[in-house]
């Protein structure tokens, strides 16, 4: 019961996190105009990963996409890549975790397969969350660097009567959404990994016993039949029908993938 709850909660938390990562990636407010020097501006600038926008006090908002790929800063490209990788991994993780949920039965899927799928999705969520956190942090670092550079420039070159106010940018809402969403995805992933440990059945590694019959030799061995899912061994004892007799050493049981518990 606790395992199902942990797995379910991990799935829900990751789902919210990935939705947040998608939202943050699409949001225009990654950086917003710093209003410290001009709190009563009639023109408000903000920028996202894909376009920059200007909102006038009348409410008119104009957004322009970054129609160049080569002309964009490498850091921005890196942030885009990290966010997209995070979304893709998260989406795959969600797909895998749906089939891994203990409360959902799909055919005759065994617990070990579900455990493997839970672990896989958990790892994917962790990496997805880390990608989002890394992407947002790289962008935040870029903003901080540019902020102090523009602050230094703001107080130079004002020899004449005319002042040129340089627009400085500070953290936008998308950064906070991204950090929180990345954190949630990470937590969800950890919860899935914890749930995986509970899903993996306890098993004792016995030496297989060979029964020498007059016809074929029938061996009973734990974990000998590979599940067709491709997610690991089927830990229930299934009969292996071999054509000829085997020695005890040849028909031995191998430690399961989940013996680290």
């Amino acid at each position: 019961m606790a395992v199902t709850a942990c797995q379910g909660l991990g799935f829900v938390v990751s789902l919210i996190g990935i939705a947040g990562i998608i939202a943050a990636t699409c949001m225009d407010q990654w950086s917003t105009q710093d209003l410290y020097n001009n709190p009563v501006t009639a023109v408000f600038n903000y920028q996202g990963l894909w376009r920059s926008c200007v909102r006038e006090s009348s409410g008119f908002t104009e957004c322009r996409g970054y129609f160049t790929l080569l002309g964009l800063p490498a850091m921005l490209q890196a942030v885009r890549a990290l966010m997209i990788v995070g979304i893709v991994l998260g989406a795959i993780g969600l797909l895998v975790s749906i089939f891994a949920l203990k409360c959902i039965r799909i055919g005759s899927m065994e617990d070990s397969a579900k455990a493997n799928m839970t672990l896989t999705s958990g790892i994917m969520f962790i990496v997805s969350g880390l990608c989002a956190i890394a992407g947002v942090s790289v962008f935040a670092n870029m903003l901080v660097t540019n902020f102090w550079m523009s602050t230094a420039n703001m107080y130079t070159g004002m020899g004449g009567m005319v002042q040129t106010v340089q627009t400085r940018y500070t953290f936008g809402a998308a950064l906070f959404v991204g950090w929180v969403a990345g954190g949630l995805t990470l937590i969800g992933g950890v919860m899935m990994c914890i749930a995986c440990r509970g899903l993996a059945p306890e098993e004792t590694n016995y030496k297989a016993v060979s029964y020498h019959a007059s016809g074929h030799s029938v061996a009973y061995k734990p974990g000998g039949f590979k599940a067709s899912t491709g997610f690991g061994s089927n830990t229930k004892n299934k009969k292996i029908y071999d054509g000829g007799a085997r020695t005890e050493d040849e028909v031995q049981s191998y430690p399961s993938k989940h013996d680290y518990v």
Partner: antibody
Amino acid sequence: DVQLVESGGGLVQPGGSRKLSCAASGFTFSTFGMHWVRQAPEKGLEWVAYITSGNSPIYFTDTVKGRFTISRDNPKNTLFLQMTSLGSEDTAVYYCARSSYYGNSMDYWGQGTSVTVSS
Amino acid sequence: DIVMTQSPSSLTVTAGEKVTLTCRSSQSLLNSGNRKNYLTWYQQIPGQPPKLLIYWASTRESGVPDRFTGSGSGTYFTLTISSVQAEDLAVYYCQNAYSYPFTFGSGTKLEKK
């Protein structure tokens, strides 16, 4: 056709108060920001205040801050300017103007209402 | 506050003449986000309220004759009337539309020679 009609002007004693109104018609009043601009006799234009379509934020010129308040009644399509502690420097023709959707400009203006502050 | 300075304060013209009015601002009115200059030009005929001519420094308001042209960027702007007509005799104001408080220039009066 867009129409803005100001009212409430007249002679006011120094230190007195006055409330100006601006009745709007011919457009969806609740979706536009509105300005008050004044013009002293034989002088240039002076922007006074601005209120956004949603009543907030509100901006004032420094000379009237704390003395004037701008408000609007969207269901009644009316803009107001409440003026207190009036002085001779507030004598002017007061215009209400609609904020254009583009460029933070003022695209439609009323004919103005005259306020004279004198004893 | 942004200070707007217009010159000349008055100008005597004849019909058909080309005139250029200038406006300077104490701060740049160029917004880096959209590369637009937040400067507006108004025309006020005596006894009438002002009329919007040009916004974003160079965009003509609908219904404004194409003899009116706005140009300039940053802190220096001009309004050019390619061929002055009798109905153009008025006071022309430039306005900072970049930050509050919005400020107007002192105006340039166009008079008949």
